[in-house]
Amino acid sequence: MGKGDPKKPRGKMSSYAFFVQTCREEHKKKHPDASVNFSEFSKKCSERWKTMSAKEKGKFEDMAKADKARYEREMKTYIPPKGETKKKFKDPNAPKRPPSAFFLFCSEYRPKIKGEHPGLSIGDVAKKLGEMWNNTAADDKQPYEKKAAKLKEKYEKDIAAYRAKGKPDAAKKGVVKAEKSKKKKEEEEDEEDEEDEEEEEDEEDEDEEEDDDDE
């Protein structure tokens, strides 16, 4: 993603990403010279997020909403350069990215939206689900957030094992270099997660349209 079009709008950030960013800034202020142990820091952030009240999370949810609006606004006017439609190679054996809480919620309520509005386009179904999610109280989002956090934890373990296990010889030579870029890569992946999820959701919608006869 870093090597992509510099004019491309920055990916939208989730409420959790804003929270992590705030944590990082706080940490930097308190310990300007200390180096950050990424996995330990992530764990602490995640634990803190889980114990936060709906009120405390609200601030970050508002930031995410505003950033989503900014991203959508910028994407409307963004024209990708020619030939930039190819996706980077993805190993089919790599652990599948975990779904977000919103994605899990969509899986629960998409059948209802599609059933009540049979003529609705994929985009409009997604829009309705987005509205539904935004109108859902924080405590009602919690079961989905808990499940998403569990799946994220599992994914992080799986991806670590996957990375440790199978790298071609050429890659092994660059281990030291790779470690240094790992932190940056993980930050980029956080941004990519959301884009991938949107794509997966569209694919899932298309699959479901084929499966609708079963319902």
Partner: antibody, heavy 120, light 107 residues
Framework: EVQLLESGGGLVQPGGSLRLSCAAS????????TGWVRQAPGKGLEWVSG????????QYADSVKGRFTISRDNSKNTLYLQMNSLRAEDTAVYYC?????????????WGQGTLVTVSS | DIQMTQSPSSLSASVGDRVTIICRAN??????LNWYQQKPGKAPKLLIS???SLESGVPSRFSGSGSGTEFTLSISSLQPEDFASYYC?????????FGQGTNLEIR
């Protein structure tokens, strides 16, 4: 017409178990979050538990957590409440209710209720 | 837990009267406030959701307002079938608590 019909209530001794059922009809059951709300004799309403459309996500009031289990069978259009380690304070009319707006606890349809009496 | 307090607990009124029931939350619940009507021996019936949205089939003499911590249910001109108990409920935070109820009786 939307209908919710509870059954399974009755007299049980403290420490005993009971399983309530709620048969749904008149709507696509698998689209809706459903749950249980109870009302002690002559008292107000108390939310007990909720379950998502697929049955994959559940919520409980602290007063019943670890003792009650909510579940559903979408193929049978039925909601269940397994109640274990029953106490005198669980005595109430148990209503099955549908959440009409996504995961938000707005109960737009209710059953007629089934009475659970916990007494020795 | 969020505590919901209704006032008054009971209310006597006559057909044609305008009545108002107040529901207070001990912390902010935005507009996640719903009103139910219950008649003796029957299940509750949803009247208003999200503070002010009237459910379909509910007469327009019923209305709801408020936000934050204070909410009201108003009945503009009481009809004989309106004599019942009324409950407010917050759907903002688990456990989803109800008010203790207001019993509306014929004077």
């Amino acid at each position: 017409e939307v209908q919710l019909l509870e059954s399974g209530g009755g007299l049980v001794q403290p420490g005993g178990s009971l399983r309530l059922s709620c048969a749904a009809s008149g709507f696509t059951f698998s689209w809706y979050e459903t749950g249980w709300v109870r009302q002690a004799p002559g008292k107000g309403l108390e939310w007990v538990s909720g379950i998502s459309p697929s049955g994959g996500y559940t919520q409980y009031a602290d007063s019943v957590k670890g003792r009650f289990t909510i579940s559903r069978d979408n193929s049978k259009n039925t909601l269940y409440l397994q109640m274990n380690s029953l106490r005198a304070e669980d005595t109430a009319v148990y209503y099955c209710a549908r959440s009409g707006v996504g995961a938000t606890k707005i109960f737009d349809y209710w059953g007629q209720g089934t009475l659970v009496t916990v007494s020795s | 837990d969020i505590q919901m307090t209704q006032s008054p607990s009971s209310l006597s009124a006559s057909v044609g009267d305008r009545v108002t029931i107040i529901c207070r939350a001990n912390e902010r619940i935005n507009t996640y406030l719903n009103w139910y009507q219950q008649k003796p021996g029957k299940a509750p019936k949803l009247l208003i959701s999200g503070t002010s949205s009237l459910e379909s089939g509910v007469p327009s003499r019923f209305s709801g307002s408020g936000s934050g911590t204070e909410f009201t249910l108003s009945i503009s001109s009481l009809q004989p079938e309106d004599f019942a108990s009324y409950y407010c409920q917050q759907s903002y935070s688990s456990p989803y608590t109800f008010g203790q109820g207001t019993n509306l009786e014929i004077r």
